[in-house]
C-alpha cells in the first residue's frame, strides 16, 4: 500500500487561555529527510490553511514568526500547538502531512481534529 | 476572482525549446503546490511535473525526466515550464493545475497548445 | 507507479438514467487521495470528486464517490444533457500522479 496514514484526535479542548495541543503521527512509507506539515482548518467544505512547517528530520519545526502554531517533533510525531483561539474558532483541524524528500512524495491526510474553545467568562467586578 | 492563465505555447520544430508561463490570481499562491498535466489530442491526461510550496522540491514524470525544468516565481505568482529537446510525442494542451490544501488539482488553467513537427 | 484503470471505455446512457463508472488502481489507493475529474471538449478538467467520496465546491449531489483499497467507483444518478462528457479518475496520495484513461459518458 503507497498510502500514507496519518492519525490524530478526535476531540480536543482548548485551555480557558485559548491554547489546543495535539499530537499528529504519521506512518511514513519511506525515509523521509524533509517533511511539511500543514494545519488545515475546515468549515462546511471551505479549507484553509491556519499554519504550516517544514522540517528535516531530527531537527525542530520552524514555524514563521507570525505563526499562531508551534511545535515539537520525535520521529514521525509531531505536536501541535495552536494559541490564540476562540469560540468562533471551533471546528475540525486536519493534520495534513508531506513527505517532500527523498523521492517518491508522499501525502498523508488526517482525520481531523475537533477543537472547541470556550471563551472565558468575564471577571465579575469586584470591591476588593 | 481565483485562476490560472497560461501562456508560451505555439509551433516548435523538434529538438526545440518553448518555456510555458502560468499567472495565478485570486489566492495566495505560495500556500500552495503547483503542476502541469498535458493532453495528448484524442488522448487522456497525464501528469507531467510537480513544484513544492518554495520550490526546493520538484518532481517529473520519465516521459519528460533530463527535458523539462519546471519552476516558481511566488513574488510573481507565476509557474513556469522549461521544456528542451521537443519532441513529436511532446505535442499536447499542457495545463497548470493547483495541488488543492487537500491534495488534488483543484483549479485548472483553460490549457495552452504546443505542437511539435518539422 | 500506481496504474489506474477505467472501465468502460464508453457508457451509453439515456438522460435521466444512471451512471456507473469504475477505476481500479494496481495497488492500494487510502479513499482519502482518489479523485474524479470531468472533462468536456475543448474545456480543462473540472474536479468532481476527492477523497473517494466528497464533493467538490459546486458539484450537484446527483454526483457520489464511493470505494476503498483498489476498487472505487463514480455514480451519477440521473444524467442531465450537460453530465456528457469524459470522466478521468486520478491518484494523488504519492508520486507520481497517475490519471485513469478516461470513460466516456455519451448519449444512447
Known amino acids: 500500500c503507497k498510502a500514507m496514514h496519518v492519525a490524530q484526535p478526535a476531540v480536543v479542548l482548548a485551555s480557558s487561555r485559548g491554547i489546543a495541543s495535539f499530537v499528529c503521527e504519521y506512518a511514513s512509507p519511506g525515509k523521509a529527510t524533509e517533511v511539511r506539515v500543514t494545519v488545515l482548518r475546515q468549515a462546511d467544505s471551505q479549507v484553509t490553511e491556519v499554519c504550516a512547517a517544514t522540517y528535516m528530520m531530527g531537527n525542530e519545526l520552524t514555524f514563521l514568526d507570525d505563526s499562531i502554531c508551534t511545535g515539537t517533533s520525535s520521529g514521525n510525531q509531531v505536536n501541535l500547538t495552536i494559541q490564540g483561539l476562540r469560540a468562533m474558532d471551533t471546528g475540525l483541524y486536519i493534520c495534513k502531512v508531506e513527505l517532500m524528500y527523498p523521492p517518491p512524495y508522499y501525502l498523508g491526510i488526517g482525520n481531523g481534529t475537533q477543537i472547541y474553545v470556550i471563551d472565558p467568562e468575564p471577571c465579575p467586578d469586584s470591591d476588593f | 476572482e481565483v485562476q490560472l492563465v497560461e501562456s508560451g505555447g505555439g509551433l516548435v520544430k523538434p529538438g526545440g525549446s518553448l518555456r510555458l508561463s502560468c499567472a495565478a490570481s485570486g489566492f495566495t499562491f505560495s500556500s500552495y503546490t503547483m503542476h502541469w498535466v498535458r493532453q495528448a489530442p484524442g488522448k487522456g491526461l497525464e501528469w507531467v511535473s510537480f513544484i513544492s510550496y518554495d520550490g526546493n522540491y520538484k518532481y517529473y514524470a520519465d516521459s519528460v525526466k533530463g527535458r523539462f525544468t519546471i519552476s516558481r516565481d511566488n513574488a510573481k505568482n507565476s509557474l513556469y515550464l522549461q521544456m528542451n529537446s521537443l519532441r513529436a510525442e511532446d505535442t499536447a494542451v499542457y495545463y497548470c493545475?493547483?495541488?488543492?490544501?487537500?491534495?488534488?488539482?483543484?483549479?485548472w488553467g483553460q490549457g495552452t497548445m504546443v505542437t511539435v513537427s518539422s | 507507479e500506481i496504474v489506474l484503470t477505467q472501465s468502460p471505455g464508453t457508457l451509453s446512457v439515456s438522460p435521466g438514467e444512471r451512471a456507473t463508472l469504475s477505476c481500479r488502481a494496481s495497488q492500494s489507493v487510502g479513499s482519502s487521495y482518489l479523485a474524479w475529474y470531468q472533462q468536456k471538449p475543448g474545456q480543462a478538467p473540472r474536479l468532481l470528486i476527492y477523497g473517494a467520496f466528497s464533493r467538490a465546491t459546486g458539484i450537484p449531489d446527483r454526483f457520489s464517490g464511493s470505494g476503498s483499497g483498489t476498487d472505487f467507483t463514480l455514480t451519477i444518478s440521473r444524467l442531465e444533457p450537460e453530465d456528457f462528457a469524459v470522466y478521468y479518475c486520478q491518484q494523488y496520495g504519492s508520486s507520481p500522479w497517475t490519471f485513469g484513461q478516461g470513460t466516456k459518458v455519451e448519449i444512447k
Open positions: 493545475a493547483r495541488g488543492g490544501h487537500l491534495g488534488p488539482f483543484d483549479l
